[in-house]
């Protein structure tokens, strides 16, 4: 009785999810059979979240849009073991989009979620950030510093990174 | 090659407003905010704020709001700065200034002057 | 606001000499510091950005370095044409702030 209510919970939290994924891939979280971590297919998944790379170019707006739309947003990247985890599935030609922007040019960064911004716990290239018109943040590989931050004009297409909470059931 | 070209000297009793306008030509105008920069007889430089040419928004120098009002028509490529409730302290000349990478202002306008004289 | 301290005020130095002068921020500004050029004419342009960047068109005789607070602009070979006032400025928090100015005179 208490498995056929758990399943009927599940399938129900499932049913939520299958209009924005129709597939998801679920893993055991620890011993306990009750607990399943699910990102959608084909996303990857690290730590608690779930990260899509999305190859079509857009803007910075066009782009969180396009995150939200799949109940996620722009990537948010809070340790340099995350964003270790990213980086592995970019491509080092292409530049990618952050949820990070500083919407009135005044050099106040902010992230999408509202997580505080932390200028201790930043990956900007040397010499970057440098200019009051470029006030969105992408993340691209430079042969001499490897993968970090950037800021360029929001209105310029760029693939983009998009990330959300694993999904439990 | 980048150019601002600036409108000419103004004359202007104490109490009135004047508009300057600043047109920039050479680069694609609104991909460059512009900034206008203040220097008064024999002083040094002081920086008035910015506006962007993309979104129309402005970050003013706290010394300097209600005095000035920043606007842009991308039609014409032309930014232009609007002094109010002139006194004597206003007379000086007015720069424009295109917005640069590093936090820098690359290439700037002739400067108008104004002068603020009953 | 981020004080500018400019020195000399006024400089005169020879045809060929090599000329410094020095801007100290009151804190730090992390690299963006910026140099201009203003020319009797009223005319200003940009020489140096980031500390050491050379504009476009600057020639190479003028140079830039420093950090932290205490940044310096350098001369060498001065020539007739530099005759200007020089602008240090820094770009790391706005509102953004000069220094006061230094003359150079040709003796």
């Known amino acids: 009785n208490f498995m056929y209510s758990k399943t009927v919970k599940r399938l129900s939290k499932l049913r939520e999810y299958q209009q924005y994924h129709p597939s998801l891939t679920c893993v055991m979280e620890g011993k306990d059979i009750e607990d399943w971590s699910c990102c959608p297919t084909p996303w990857t998944s690290f730590q608690s979240s779930c990260y899509f790379i999305s190859t079509g170019m857009q803007s910075w707006t066009k782009s969180q849009k396009n995150c939200s739309v799949m109940g996620a947003d722009l990537v948010v990247i809070n340790t340099r073991e995350e964003q270790d985890f990213i980086i592995q599935n970019l491509k080092r030609n292409s530049s990618y989009f952050l949820g990070l922007s500083d919407p009135g040019g005044r050099r106040h960064w902010q992230w999408v979620d509202q997580t505080p911004y932390n200028e201790n716990v930043t990956f900007w290239h040397s010499g970057e950030p440098n200019n009051l018109d470029e006030r969105c943040a992408i993340i691209n590989f430079r042969s001499s510093e490897e993968w970090g931050w950037n800021d360029i004009h929001c209105h310029v297409p760029q693939k983009s990174i998009c990330k959300m909470k694993k999904i439990y059931i | 090659q980048v150019q601002l070209q600036q409108s000419g000297a103004e004359v202007v009793k104490p109490g009135a407003s004047v508009k300057i306008s600043c047109k920039g030509s050479g680069y694609t105008f609104t991909d460059y905010s512009m900034h206008w920069v203040k220097q008064a007889h024999a002083k040094s430089l002081e920086w008035i704020g910015v506006?962007?040419?993309?979104?129309?928004?402005?970050n003013y120098n706290q010394k300097f709001k209600g005095k000035v009002t920043m606007t842009v028509d991308k039609s014409s490529s032309t930014a232009y700065m609007e002094l109010s409730r002139l006194t004597s302290d206003d007379t000086a000349v007015y720069y424009c200034a295109r917005n640069g990478n590093f936090y820098v202002m690359d290439y700037w306008g002739q400067g108008t002057l104004v002068t603020v004289s009953s | 606001d981020i004080q500018m301290t400019q020195s000399p005020s006024s400089l005169s130095a020879s045809v060929g000499d090599r000329v410094t002068i020095t801007c100290q921020a009151s804190?730090?500004?992390?690299?963006?510091l910026n140099w201009y050029q203003q020319k009797p004419d009223g005319t200003v342009k940009l020489l140096i950005y980031y500390t050491s960047r050379l504009h476009t068109g600057v020639p190479s005789r003028f140079s830039g370095s420093g950090s932290g607070t205490d940044y310096s602009l350098t001369i060498s070979n001065l020539d007739q044409e530099d005759i200007a006032t020089y602008y240090c400025q820094q770009g790391n928090t706005l509102p953004w702030t000069f220094g006061g100015g230094t003359k150079l005179e040709i003796k």
């Open positions: 804190q730090d500004i992390s690299n963006y």
């Open positions: 506006i962007s040419t993309y979104y129309g928004d402005s």
